[in-house]
């Protein structure tokens, strides 16, 4: 079974700082903002059958996903 | 579904500014990056620059001296200004947003040709 | 800023062969354990469209011919099996840090 792809919660370098949760990493600014002020993939209501953007994101292909992580995104840690 | 739509001049006289806006419907540009982008006549992407969720803006130092981009959220709207323009600024302009966390520009307007010439 | 060179510049294939193109950075683009590398496809008068992000992972819509590899420098776009709407002009680009750069693109032509 595919894992989607991990969040900017990398293991292998240091996390120049934690977020809190409802925060996440922006990678340009380089520190912790609200989620929501990031254009994150927002969860479709149950039921929903309207197609997707042409080139929106999907979880599908792992990007190195360690067991367990869930699919982008993922606040906290960077 | 995010939907981005150029809109301004076709024709811009040399030394003039360009002005385009892009409208965004299906989020709101206090979400995210919002990016302008642009492709000269048979030729690759050139990336101008940004604005952000909070209004701050970052433009690619070859176009710096010359490009303001700035926004108006009751509108949903953002807009790029390109001064002194010359012919070399005759190219395809997009604006494009990416997704967060690998920021990769997934939605895109269709595009606008913005010719100099007098 | 971070230069991405695309080879080959054109490849001539015919439907149901096998596409590689190349995309090499000056400098890595991994960051976080993420590869911050994307591919576009697009075709004339068309916007770009985004086919492949953070190195390997589909765009929603996307066929499972297109798929994406590599890491650090180097990286591959593959399309397994050419259909005829698949020749298009094909760009990477690095989202690792702005200025987000391109490549200048590998044309996928009919032999």
């Known amino acids: 079974m595919r894992r989607g792809p991990r969040s900017l919660r990398g293991r292998d370098a240091p996390a120049p700082t934690p977020c809190v949760p409802a925060e996440c990493f922006d990678l340009l600014v380089r520190h912790c903002v609200a989620c929501g002020l990031l254009r994150t993939p927002r969860p479709k209501p149950a039921g929903a059958s309207s197609p997707a953007p042409r080139t929106a994101l999907q979880p599908q292909e792992s990007v190195g996903a360690g067991a367990g992580e869930a699919a982008l995104p993922l606040p906290g840690l960077l | 579904e995010v939907q981005l739509q150029e809109s301004g001049p076709g024709l811009v006289k040399p030394s003039q500014t360009l002005s385009l806006t892009c409208t965004v419907s299906?989020?709101?540009?206090?979400?995210?990056?919002w990016n302008w982008i642009r492709q000269h006549p048979g030729k690759g992407l050139e990336y101008i620059g940004y604005?952000?969720?909070?209004?701050?803006?970052y433009y690619n130092p070859s176009l710096k001296s010359r490009v303001t981009i700035s926004r108006d959220t009751s509108k949903n709207q953002y807009s790029l200004k390109l001064s002194s323009v010359t012919a070399a600024d005759t190219a395809v302009y997009y604006c494009?947003?990416?997704?967060?966390?690998?920021?990769?520009?997934?939605?895109w307007g269709q595009g606008t040709l913005v010719t100099v010439s007098s | 800023d971070i230069v991405l060179t695309q080879s080959p510049a054109t490849l001539s294939l015919s439907p149901g062969e096998r596409a590689t193109l190349s995309c090499r950075a000056s400098?890595?683009?991994?960051?976080?354990?993420?590869?911050?590398m994307n591919w576009f496809q697009q075709k004339p008068g068309q916007a770009p469209r985004l086919l492949i992000y953070?190195?390997?992972n589909r765009a929603t819509g996307i066929p499972a011919r297109f798929s994406g590899s590599g890491s650090g420098t180097d990286f591959t776009l593959t399309i397994s099996s050419l259909e005829p709407e698949d020749f298009a002009v094909y760009y990477c680009?690095?989202?690792?840090?702005?200025?987000?750069?391109f490549g200048g693109g590998t044309k996928v032509e009919i032999k």
């Open positions: 494009a947003s990416p997704n967060y966390p690998f920021y990769a520009m997934d939605y």
């Open positions: 299906g989020d709101s540009i206090t979400s995210g990056y």
């Open positions: 604005i952000s969720y909070s209004g701050s803006t």
């Open positions: 400098e890595s683009v991994d960051n976080y354990g993420i590869s911050f």
């Open positions: 953070a190195a390997s």
């Open positions: 680009q690095q989202s690792k840090e702005v200025p987000w750069t």
